[in-house]
């Protein structure tokens, strides 16, 4: 007996589409084999018409599919536009075509059902509009105008000129009658329903000189798109359900186990809290078509997803949906990162974010999640440099460690930081994640003064203290700017011992500034890091004044003031560019700061990290 | 809501035919997937048929051993699922429940079903 099951007897209707699922025991070997769907000749061969590994017939050319589902131990084959030609015997098996990993189906594709002579078919998904058009000659022109819809034998009014209107079609049908000279009417009937599906008669007059139309109403069910992502990963459900519905209020739902859809997220505002910090419901379009962005995709968020249209924003018979059924894939190209990051007030953090190692060239960037009605995602940062104002000198985007990763820092936190932040590029839109930062009581690792006031043309040191944990790290100081954090040149003042034996006086790196120019001004950030890994960072903002003393200034942290509330930027205002981003929708326009000036003079600002026992130390 | 009610069990004689039939109420989304199970005193639910459908689609499902005995199938009108069951033996028999789901999931698992009807009692005698 075969491993491999399915269906044995599959049967459909010409024009139709099938998709037929083969199950297999997802051992290792089982799983990343080729699997095949082939078809049985008379000599006993199998051909294959498409695999696994890409191959499709001319037969099936345009039409079919195979899709490997490897963590669920399933296949899937889609044939669409399905002809009477198509019936017969077929195998969807793995491996080796006429070895013994196969089952056996049968495809019977038949004729949809005999209809009257010049019957108009309309096809129409459930919930949409139809318009059926009934003709009439001139005589018939002043008389009644009908429809009826049969049921087996019998007859029964749906609408006629007359104003009746039968009960099971109340408020969502009409009848038009043209002006003068137009020999046709129409019968409109909106929010089709399945039960709606069947035979219509039109009629105009009476007697052996009526008219009479026949149209075939076939209300389809959306069959759910599968749709298949990976694991931490991101989906975007589009949804496009027509013009008719575009000022109704929109929603997405799950379809739950008692067959019931419970709401994801509408445009009534609300939001299921499973999907807190990692759902976006876009914007529609005049058409009012619009999109819904999960991020983090977790296992249990498989299912099935209806997107729709309500006045209370929730799933009511009638009205237009679009399905899909959401597979997560386990073996996730999206790699593992923290999905919560924990920082104290004060201190900062440096968040990991994933991205297609195939596009390091993307853009990248960083926004805030915020919950407010449909939700939103305001650029915070982007790879070019640019940062909201408000983050000036705490925020910074670095390509580092590259090869599918780059890394947001943030420092100087505050309770308001607290909340979910998404990353994303602006290539493959499945590799949004999400990360939820949280801060907790605590204090920062690493302490630098609140606020430095530099002379112009003297000498300034600015201690940096750090605990023993970060002995083994790189030490480093930087100059913030909008486009990053410069790393300001090392001292290198010979071998040092200053960390072997770490004691509480020789957790020191001090940065230099020698002379101290204009262009010093700004942001300076003292950090650790490991490779091109960053870990903590603590900022100081230096102010440079004209001269007033003469000598060298040292500043200790027991002496630094609150860094300025008021410094007055050269600030910038622009839009965020639509093309930078696949769907610019996601985020709204937001004020952003432009270049803060020079970076610091090369050799005149060093880094020195020693002992104030051993001043002969040098930092890496 | 979805209810599940099986009906059309008995008696019968080895070789005899029986018809059982699977009736749902409440609403199902499009695609859909019922299953008919057996179980035998002492013995696990074992799988005999299922049949799914999405439109005009459909896609029938037989354990090996009930293969050209029985045949299930779906009345559109009734909102039912019957189970022809013909050449029946006496391992046949057992109580018969059919199960219900909207996800194409592995039918021969009893884990793929959300709820179940209460069942039938199908006895074979030679």
């Known amino acids: 007996k075969s491993p491999v099951f399915g269906p044995q007897e599959v049967s459909s209707v010409e024009g139709n589409s099938v998709s037929i699922k083969c199950y297999y025991p997802p051992t290792s070997v089982n799983r990343h084999t080729r699997k095949y769907w082939c078809r049985k000749g008379a000599s006993g061969r199998c051909i294959t018409l498409v695999s696994s590994e890409g191959y499709v017939s001319s037969n099936y050319a345009g039409r079919a599919n195979l899709t490997n589902f490897p963590e669920n131990g399933t296949f899937v084959v889609n044939i669409a536009q399905l002809s009477r030609d198509d019936s017969g015997h077929y195998k969807c098996g793995l491996g080796i075509n006429s070895r013994g990993l196969s089952f056996d189906v049968s495809l019977e594709v038949s004729q949809g059902p005999e209809l009257p002579n010049g019957t108009e078919v309309y096809t129409v998904d459930v919930g949409r509009t139809v318009t059926i058009k009934c003709p009439f000659k001139t005589e018939n022109a002043p008389k009644t105008k009908a429809l009826y819809k049969k049921i087996g034998q019998t007859s029964v009014l749906v609408i006629d000129s007359r104003n009746y209107v039968n009960p099971n079609y109340k408020d969502r049908i009409r009848l038009r009658i043209p002006g003068t000279g137009q020999l046709i009417f129409t019968v409109v009937i909106d929010r089709l329903r399945l039960s709606d599906h069947g035979l219509y008669l039109c009629q105009a007059g009476d007697g052996s000189n009526r008219d009479e139309k026949n149209a075939d109403l076939q209300v389809l069910e959306p069959e759910p798109e599968l749709v298949y992502e990976d694991l931490r990963g991101s989906v975007t459900f589009h949804c496009a359900l027509g013009l008719e519905v575009a000022n109704v209020a929109k929603f997405l739902c799950r379809v739950n186990s008692r067959e019931t859809c419970d709401v994801v997220i509408n445009t009534l505002g609300k939001r299921d809290s499973a999907f807190e910090g990692r759902i976006l419901l876009n914007p529609q379009d005049k058409d009012g078509s619009f999109s819904v962005v999960i991020t983090g995709l977790r296992k249990e968020d498989e299912g099935r997803y209806l997107c729709g249209a309500h006045s209370d924003g929730q799933l009511q018979e009638g009205w237009p949906i679009q399905a899909w059924q959401l597979f997560v894939n386990e073996e996730s190209t999206i790699p593992r990162s923290p999905t919560v990051v924990k920082g104290v007030a004060g201190g900062s953090v440096a968040v990991l974010c994933p991205y297609n190692p195939k596009e390091s060239q993307s853009l990248k960037y960083w926004c805030l999640w915020e919950g407010a009605q449909n939700g939103r995602c305001p650029l915070l940062v982007e790879s070019q440099g640019l940062v909201q104002e408000q983050y000036e000198g705490r925020l910074s985007l670095l390509q580092e460690p590259g090869n599918g990763t780059f890394t947001v820092i943030l420092n100087q936190l505050t309770t308001q930081d607290a909340g979910f932040y998404w990353c994303l590029t602006n290539g493959d839109t499945r590799w949004r994640t999400t990360v939820e930062i949280k801060i907790i009581e605590g204090e920062p690792n690493l302490k630098v003064p609140g606020n430095v006031t530099a002379v112009l043309g003297e000498t300034l040191n600015i201690p940096c203290h750090f605990p023993c944990k970060f002995s083994s790290y790189e030490k480093y100081w930087c100059k913030w700017s909008n486009t990053g954090c410069q790393t300001l040149p090392s001292q290198d003042e010979g071998p040092s011992e200053a960390f072997v034996n770490c004691d509480e006086n020789s957790r020191l790196v001090s940065l230099t500034l020698n002379p101290v120019t204009r262009a010093d001004e700004g942001w300076y950030w003292c950090g650790v890091k490991q490779g091109h890994f960053y870990g903590e960072t603590a900022a100081v903002y230096v102010a440079v004044e004209e001269k007033k003393v003469a000598g060298s200034r040292y500043v200790s942290p027991a002496k630094a003031d609150a860094a300025p509330d008021e410094k007055v930027l050269d600030s910038g205002v622009r839009e965020i560019e639509n093309k930078a981003i696949q769907d610019p929708r996601l985020f709204a326009e937001e004020k952003v700061v432009a270049d803060t000036g020079d970076q610091a003079g090369g050799s005149r600002a060093s880094v020195d990290s020693s002992s104030s026992e051993e001043q002969g130390g040098s930092s890496k | 809501e979805v209810q599940l009610v099986e009906s059309g069990g008995g008696l019968v004689q080895a070789g005899g035919s029986l018809r059982l039939s699977c009736a749902a109420s409440?609403?199902?989304?499009?695609?859909?997937?019922m299953g008919w199970f057996r179980q035998a005193p002492g013995k696990e639910r074992e799988f005999v048929g299922a049949i799914s459908w999405s439109g005009s689609s459909t896609y029938k499902y037989y354990e090996d051993s009930v293969k050209g005995r029985f045949t299930i199938s779906r009345d559109n009108a009734k909102n039912t699922v019957p189970l022809q069951m013909n050449s029946l033996k006496p391992e046949d028999t057992g109580v018969y429940f059919c199960g219900g789901t909207m996800e194409r999931r592995d039918p021969r698992r009893t884990s793929a079903y959300d709820y179940w009807g209460q069942g039938t009692l199908v006895t074979v005698s030679s």
């Open positions: 409440g609403r199902t989304f499009g695609s859909y997937s």
